[in-house]
């Protein structure tokens, strides 16, 4: 992984593109920290395991987060 101690935030670019929840392998939400002052959202896609940085401010991404949390609450007993 191209990481050095000087890298602060994970995302070089962020995407506004809608993501189909069915194509998601994993969704990581990284809270602000001493290294990176803002939230970062990283989607891991089922196809090839591609990882994509998403824009937390985008309406499409906010809808995705809602859909994913809804799905999780359905699954939990």
């Amino acid at each position: 992984i191209p990481l050095s101690r000087t890298v602060r935030c994970t995302c070089i670019s962020i995407s506004n593109q809608p993501v189909n929840p069915r194509s998601l392998e994993k969704l990581e939400i990284i809270p602000p920290s001493q290294f990176c002052p803002h939230v970062e959202i990283i989607a891991t896609m089922k196809k090839k395991g591609e990882k994509r940085c998403l824009n937390p401010e985008s309406k499409a991404i906010k809808n995705l987060l809602k859909a994913v949390s809804k799905e999780r609450s359905k699954r939990s007993p």
Epitope: R8, C9, T10, C11, S13, K48, C53
Partner: antibody
């Protein structure tokens, strides 16, 4: 359509300074990391510098560290390269390029939009 | 620092032929971090492939990328007249830095 336009190139004496600009249109500039890449006459491509979408990280090729500074003004959709202590070997076409949507340290989507370049000649 | 080597330096082929371009890294590179670009004389480079094998938007399917570890390949299945150009591989490495290979020129036989 997505477009990048560089400006600020010219002929400059060794040891002097120059500031390049790159103006973006057709996409949300503040969402994308940006690069400067150069190409010396008759040579291949050489990556120069990158700045994250939010300006939180900046990195440089060793040969320009301490002399060049990459910066951006998201309110003006503009990327800059401040070049100080210029040397003959900095003579090149300088391209700005957009980092692909969603790129991060775990997956790289490539430089997907390029400007046409601005020429910098360092000569006495 | 990872060094990329491209071979051959020049590839002389005729339209309709298959072109196979090689990119070798001095150390193992994750396929997630390898890209290919095309550059025609007097023009800016154009992204062809990212993630070693995914075609960029608008790139015809005659272009394909493959490989892993230290050996990567760009294949043009049937050369069209507009494909004669210089091709560069590029990797995103630690520090982080973005290194280009020296390029392979595909010219008309």
């Amino acid at each position: 359509q997505m477009q990048l336009v560089e400006s600020g190139g010219g002929v400059v004496q060794p040891g002097r300074s120059l500031r390049l600009s790159c103006t973006a249109s057709g996409f949300t500039f503040s969402n994308n990391g940006m690069h400067w890449v150069r190409q010396a006459p008759g040579k291949g491509l050489e990556w120069v510098a990158v700045i994250w979408f939010d300006g939180m990280n900046k990195f440089y090729v060793d040969s320009v560290k301490g002399r060049f500074t990459i910066s951006r003004d998201n309110s003006k959709n503009t990327l800059y390269l401040e070049m100080n202590s210029l040397r003959a070997e900095d003579t090149a076409i300088y391209y700005c390029a957009r980092e692909g949507d969603g790129s991060g340290i775990y997956y790289y989507y490539g430089m997907d939009v390029w400007g046409q370049g601005t020429t910098v000649t360092v000569s006495s | 620092e990872i060094v990329l080597t491209q071979s051959p330096g020049t590839l002389s082929l005729s339209p309709g032929e298959r072109a196979t371009l090689s990119c070798r890294a001095s150390q193992s590179v994750s396929s997630s971090y390898l890209a290919w670009y095309q550059q025609k004389p007097g023009q800016a480079p154009r992204l062809l492939i990212y993630g070693a094998s995914s075609r960029a938007t608008g790139i015809p399917d005659r272009f394909s990328g493959s490989g892993s570890g230290t050996d990567f390949t760009l294949t043009i299945s049937r050369l069209e007249p507009e494909d004669f150009a210089v091709y560069y591989c590029q990797q995103y490495g630690s520090s982080p830095i973005f290194t280009f290979g020296p390029g392979t020129k595909v010219d008309i036989k």
